[in-house]
Interface confidence: low
């Protein structure tokens, strides 16, 4: 199939964001101290507001049946055609895309329109391909598409394991959600980060915004306020705060370091889980709350984001002698975990190096060109190219391949920034083995 319907640009030009929004909104170091209760309440309210707005922004207008009539342009050198059109061979005319066959989402000088996606079997067509927007496909009822296997719809589980209770239904974008009866800990062990904002996904329209949603929102906000006050007054705050600040932002600037390798999931974790599960509105797809709690380490020492930052300080000499391996903090799939971080790379890699980097990683000219055409905007171009690389390379698309390519291009600063970012996001950690055994 040509291009996944889920990743296709929406009419608005926004493409699916995996996890949090732009980097500016989340990676910053903490500024002046503010009352702790306020931090939690504001974060919770923002979470609710953005969840609600995500529902609203997903409302699709009636599909436009025809694009604007053909338009003439003055000269080829400034010849751009509107969405729903492509430029003619001689550069003089704008030719309409064929409705239901192809499309173009931006003002462009494409010589032909992009081909519409055909939904796979097991998918339903949520909205048809128009001349200005690709088909939007969604998994059939009883199946879902998750981040780990975006190429296919998987069957939802029929029930929860023993000792667990269902708190979330099967949706086209998430499996049923189960939590432990006693603690409220999710079955997957995932802990959505409070600090993250939830952004909408063109590929996965949410259910319509309704009065009940607003009522739930207000109720949840009230509960959050009460819980926040309780937590603030309790002695557990000191244990909870590093999690809240560290899981998503990597604890940058936070003086309290949490040693994850020595910490066993226990009572403190359950308090956090309960707080977070209260904060999470049930309408928000589970998969969009992506930051995961690292599972208990098995056999190797996992370092906390805080410790990881200290690891970056030794001299270059040691760095060259021993290569430390970056591994997913949650023991998840390395390629998928890396993919979740692509959103921020546009801020870390200089624009001039985007194409050389992708060529170094093995993308061909037209793959780069198609990625550019599919991107929802300038900033999304690198993201789209990196996704193409992952789709093309599969399991071979490793964080080390990417870092090595940057090194080869002489982009050492960008390499360092990405390494730092992967660590501080809490998604990656250094693998510590016996002497050099774990080093490559």
């Amino acid at each position: 199939m040509e291009q996944r319907g889920q990743n296709a640009p929406a009419a608005s030009g926004a493409r699916k964001r995996h996890g949090p929004g732009p980097r500016e909104a989340r990676g910053a170091r903490p500024g002046p101290r503010v009352p702790k209760t306020l931090v939690l309440v504001v974060a919770a309210v923002l979470l609710l507001v953005s969840a609600e707005s995500a529902l609203i922004t997903q409302q699709d207008l009636a599909p436009q049946q025809r694009a604007a009539p053909q338009q003439k342009r003055s000269s080829p050198s400034e010849g751009l055609c509107p969405p729903g059109h492509h430029i003619s061979e001689d550069g003089r005319d704008c030719i309409s895309c064929k409705y239901g066959q192809d499309y173009s989402t931006h003002w462009n000088d494409l010589l032909f329109c992009l081909r519409c996606t055909r939904c796979d079997s097991g998918e339903v067509e949520l909205s048809p391909c128009t001349t200005t927007r690709n088909t939007v496909c969604q998994c059939e009822e009883g199946t879902f598409r998750e981040e780990d296997s975006p190429e296919m719809c998987r069957k939802c589980r029929t029930g929860c394991p023993r000792g667990m209770v269902k708190v979330g239904d099967c949706t086209p974008w998430s499996d049923i959600e189960c939590v432990h009866k006693e603690s409220g800990t999710k079955h997957s062990g995932e802990v959505p980060a409070v600090e993250e904002t939830v952004t909408s996904s063109p590929g996965t329209p949410a259910s319509p915004c309704s009065l009940s949603g607003i009522i739930i929102g207000v109720t949840v906000a009230a509960v959050v306020l009460i819980v926040a006050v309780f937590v603030c007054k309790s002695l557990l705050w000191k244990k909870v705060l590093p999690y809240l600040k560290g899981i998503c932002s990597g604890g940058g600037g936070d003086p309290e370091r949490v040693d994850r390798s020595s910490q066993r999931p226990g009572a403190e974790d359950n308090v956090l889980n309960e707080i977070v599960s209260i904060l999470q509105p049930t309408q928000v797809p589970e998969q969009e709350m992506e930051v995961q709690e690292p599972a208990e380490p098995t056999g190797v020492n996992m370092l906390s984001p805080g410790e990881s930052e200290h690891l970056l300080e030794p001299a270059e000499a040691e760095r060259s002698q021993r290569r430390r391996l970056l591994v997913p903090a949650n023991e998840g799939d390395p390629t998928e975990t890396l993919r979740q971080c692509f959103d921020d790379f546009a801020d870390l890699v200089p624009f001039d190096s985007w194409e050389p980097l992708m060529r170094k990683l093995g993308l061909m000219d037209n793959e780069i060109k198609v990625a550019k055409a599919e991107a929802a905007g300038h900033r999304d171009t690198l993201y789209t190219m990196l996704i193409k690389w992952v789709n093309k390379t599969g399991r071979d698309a490793s964080v080390h391949t990417l870092l090595d390519a940057l090194e080869t291009l002489g982009e050492r600063l960008a390499k360092q920034k990405i390494e730092d970012h992967l660590l501080s996001s809490g998604k990656f950690m250094y693998l510590e083995g016996n002497a050099d055994s774990a080093m490559s």
């Epitope: 040509e2 080829p76 050198s77 400034e78 010849g79 751009l80 430029i87 061979e89 550069g91 931006h106 003002w107 462009n108 000088d109 494409l110 010589l111 032909f112 081909r115 194409e355 061909m364 000219d365 037209n366 793959e367 060109k369 198609v370 550019k372 055409a373 905007g377 300038h378 171009t381």
Partner: antibody, heavy 129, light 107 residues
Framework: QVQLVESGGGVVQPGRSLRLSCAAS????????MHWVRQAPGKGLEWVAV????????YYADSVKGRFTISRDNSKNTLYLQMNSLRAEDTAVYYC??????????????????????WGQGTTVTVSS | DIQMTQSPSSLSASVGDRVTITCRTS??????LNWYQQKPGKAPKLLIS???SLQSGVPSRFSGSGSGTDFTLTISSLQPEDFATYYC?????????FGGGTKVEIK
């Protein structure tokens, strides 16, 4: 009218160098990617190299990589092919050709399709001792 | 590199005949395929680009189809001026490659 005129061909000994030129007229040269394509006597077409509208990217066929250099002077509307370490198998008619995609400086992207819509008449290069 | 296999390498046909030339690629190239016509002693001429997009000034008897690895150039009713050599060319990735050519001769 739109025209490409190659020059610089001739007979040259193996190991020697030669520089081909291609003068463009009738269109905005710096808006187009440009190619060199060659054809050995009695054989088919072989793509040699391409240069982007602004000279920022250059690609070569494996058979000429490291020996040939494509370049352009947009102020002179001229495309060049510097051929070093010439071999007998480089004997061919060399054509310059325009890429059919227009670069638009008001567009956020440059779409590169590599279809060659305007060709020169060709210049013959013979490598023989 | 992407290999291009054109068939047949030559064919004899009469005026008015329907002629079909095929081009197969060693890997999928989506629709990034162009067709050229070349007459003896002349430069090639672009007929069709992006598999099926007819160049301006090219008669409508020429048509192209296909996607992925298999492509076809069809001349619905052969005319005297159509006797020439036809080349396919992939534009998916560099190095760009041409097919070996198909020579269309008068029967």
């Amino acid at each position: 009218q739109v025209q490409l005129v190659e020059s610089g061909g001739g007979v040259v000994q193996p190991g020697r160098s030669l520089r081909l030129s291609c003068a463009a007229s009738g269109f905005t040269f710096n808006n187009y990617g440009m190619h060199w394509v060659r054809q050995a006597p009695g054989k088919g077409l072989e793509w040699v190299a391409v240069i982007w509208y602004d000279g920022s990217n250059k690609y070569y066929a494996d058979s000429v990589k490291g020996r040939f250099t494509i370049s352009r002077d947009n102020s002179k509307n001229t495309l060049y092919l510097q051929m070093n370490s010439l071999r007998a198998e480089d004997t061919a008619v060399y054509y310059c050709a325009r890429d059919r995609t227009v670069y638009s400086n008001s567009s956020p992207f440059y779409y590169y399709y590599y279809g060659m819509d305007v060709w020169g008449q060709g210049t013959t290069v013979t490598v023989s001792s | 590199d992407i290999q291009m296999t054109q068939s047949p390498s030559s064919l004899s046909a009469s005026v008015g005949d329907r002629v079909t030339i095929t081009c197969r690629t060693s890997q999928s190239i989506s629709t990034y395929l162009n067709w050229y016509q070349q007459k003896p002693g002349k430069a090639p001429k672009l007929l069709i680009s992006a598999t099926s997009s007819l160049q301006s000034g090219v008669p409508s008897r020429f048509s192209g189809s296909g996607s992925g690895t298999d492509f076809t150039l069809t001349i619905s009713s052969l005319q005297p001026e159509d006797f020439a050599t036809y080349y396919c060319q992939q534009s998916y990735s560099t190095p760009l490659t041409f097919g070996g050519g198909t020579k269309v001769e008068i029967k």
